[in-house]
């Protein structure tokens, strides 16, 4: 409960706001989950609280778990959690899923894309941006404060873009970066009953105990912009939010992205720490919208390690 | 102890205005949230909205935005909730309460607002 | 906007007896709600926040429980001076009350 997602890159910088509203006057004691070790608050550590914000600077692979927020006011103690996960830089340009955040959608008329998360950084414009790796240039681009501008939008905008901006902490600074997939409405759209891309129906995917998993849905619905169109995971036929366990969590926004011109949508499970009993749990990647209901369903499995003599 | 003091009943004509008053004691009203609930006779209690007196943020309930305005005067303690355009349904008890972001701790004593021609 | 369902609107029970009065929302919330005592002429007193963390100075018979869509709130052992109305608060996403249960001593 009240516990919110946060990821990032390792050697970046990571801030991460706790996920229970308050004054800024409040108090907020951090804590590592796992250990109810106190997380300190002098400047001189790598991670450190400052107030609402828990500051990784930089952060560090091993920095993933859940984190204990307790916000104090006058009246009343406020518990939240902070679900960290820190990936390792990817060699290549492509963006996983799990990495993204929310789609944004333009039109002619409106085709800012703002930078994710960065009202949380001390940071100073210019905003680098990136499409699919690709630094920006041209007139039509226009990096204005948090957001950019794309002039006269064209189908072919359609991808991911990618912020990167500097983080300064007491004359120290770091490297941000945040991805999201841009999505341009197109007036000639069309709607199908849905098809799920992933996972295969009646998968199994091998995983390590104790390791972190991610399991993607992703399914398309037709072309163009879709009026509803949802996907989401269940556990044993229940709603995610139904199932008290903090270390498996859907990511909250969902993420479009357009394939072949088909409205495709993604939503990433995160499964931290993976338990024996996770084996046992069904997992139902649901694909929604006004034709009706598809199903797929995954199963975990340990990974077989072969010995060689 | 906190104590929040309220006005005085007060009676009043439709289409007129009230604001009515709540004072804190042994408290500064700048560390917490201030909200407000009307309690018509007889009837449940209807939060109406919320102010952060330490910098003037304001949140109103659908019902009655655009008739109430939250106030907050840090330097007496004392928060202010003003109702216009009043009719006959507003006749009601309004309460001020102190807490959270979400919820309320204290409550003052609340006021009667007779709305009447 | 979240809409609350408080049941029952009344109930009539004997001293002793074990009380249990229900909310349900009309969407997922977190544990964001809250319940409040009121006698009459009174102001609301809250008894338990959070969906089950006992204010200080609240007695032990007073509970509560539930997540998502339905809350749960008990009196274990009713006693003379639990004569009152409750209501639930949610507040996810502003603050809304349920619509009230008065429980009078049968």
């Known amino acids: 409960k009240f516990s919110k997602q946060s990821w990032g890159l390792e050697n970046e910088a990571l801030i991460v706001r706790c996920p229970r509203q308050g004054k800024s006057s409040y108090i907020v004691d951090w804590y590592y989950s796992q250990t109810n070790k106190s997380i300190p608050t002098q400047e001189r550590n790598r991670v450190f609280a400052s107030g609402q914000l828990l500051k990784f600077l930089p952060a560090e692979v091993a920095d993933s778990g859940i984190y204990t927020c307790i916000v104090r006011s006058p009246t009343f103690n406020r518990t939240g959690y902070a679900n960290v996960t820190i990936y390792k830089k990817q060699p290549d340009c492509n963006v996983p899923d799990y990495l993204m955040y929310s789609t944004v959608s333009g039109s002619e008329k409106n085709s800012k894309i703002y930078c994710p998360t960065i009202d949380l950084y001390n940071w100073t414009a210019p905003l680098e941006w990136f499409k699919n790796c690709q630094a920006l240039q041209g007139s039509r681009y226009k990096a204005h404060k948090s957001f950019l501008v794309i002039d006269n939008v064209m189908t072919d905008d359609a991808g991911d873009y990618t912020c990167k901006f500097i983080h300064n902490e007491n004359g120290a600074n770091y490297s941000v970066t945040a991805t999201r997939s841009f999505t341009v409405k197109d007036e000639q759209g069309f709607s199908l009953f849905p098809v799920i891309r992933a996972p295969a129906h009646n998968e199994t995917k091998e995983v390590e105990i104790g390791e972190n998993t991610n399991l993607t849905c992703s399914a398309c619905f037709g072309k163009g912009a879709q009026f509803l169109a949802t996907v989401q995971w269940q556990l044993n036929g229940n709603k995610i939010t139904d199932f008290s366990e903090p270390r498996i969590q859907q990511e909250e926004g969902q993420n479009q992205s357009f394939s072949n011109g088909l409205a495709c949508v993604n939503t990433v499970l995160r499964i931290a720490d993976v338990k024996e009993e996770d084996l046992l749990l069904r997992y139902d990647c649901l694909a929604l919208n006004l034709h009706g209901l598809r199903r797929h369903t995954i199963r975990l499995s340990r990974k077989h390690h072969h010995h060689h003599h | 102890e906190v104590q929040l003091v309220q006005s005085g009943a007060e009676v009043k004509k439709p289409g007129a205005t009230v604001k009515i008053s709540c004072k804190v004691s042994?408290?500064?009203?700048?560390?917490?949230?201030m909200h407000w609930v009307q309690q018509a006779p007889g009837k449940g209690l209807e939060w109406m909205g919320r102010?952060?007196?330490?910098?003037?943020?304001?949140e109103y309930a659908e019902k009655f935005q655009g008739r109430v305005t939250i106030t907050a005067d840090t330097s007496t303690d004392t928060a202010y909730m003003e109702l216009s355009s009043l009719r006959s349904e507003d006749t009601a008890v309004y309460y001020c309460?102190?807490?959270?972001?979400?919820?309320?701790?204290?409550w003052g004593q609340g006021t009667l607002v007779t709305v009447s021609s | 906007d979240i809409q609350m369902t408080q049941s029952p609107s009344s109930l009539s029970a004997s001293v002793g007896d074990r009380v249990t009065i229900t909310c349900i929302t009309n969407t997922d919330i977190d544990d964001v709600i809250h319940w409040y005592q009121q006698k009459p002429g009174k102001a609301p007193k809250l008894l338990i926040y959070e969906g089950n963390t006992l204010r200080p100075g609240v007695p032990s018979r007073f509970s509560g429980s539930g997540s998502g869509t339905d809350f749960t709130f008990t009196i274990s052992s009713l006693q003379p001076e639990d004569i009152a109305t409750y209501y639930c608060?949610?507040?996810?996403?502003?603050?809304?009350f349920g619509q009230g249960t008065k429980l009078e001593i049968k």
């Open positions: 608060l949610q507040s996810d996403n502003m603050l809304t």
């Open positions: 309460a102190t807490g959270d972001f979400y919820a309320m701790a204290y």
């Open positions: 102010i952060d007196p330490a910098i003037g943020n304001t």
């Open positions: 042994a408290f500064n009203i700048k560390d917490d949230y």
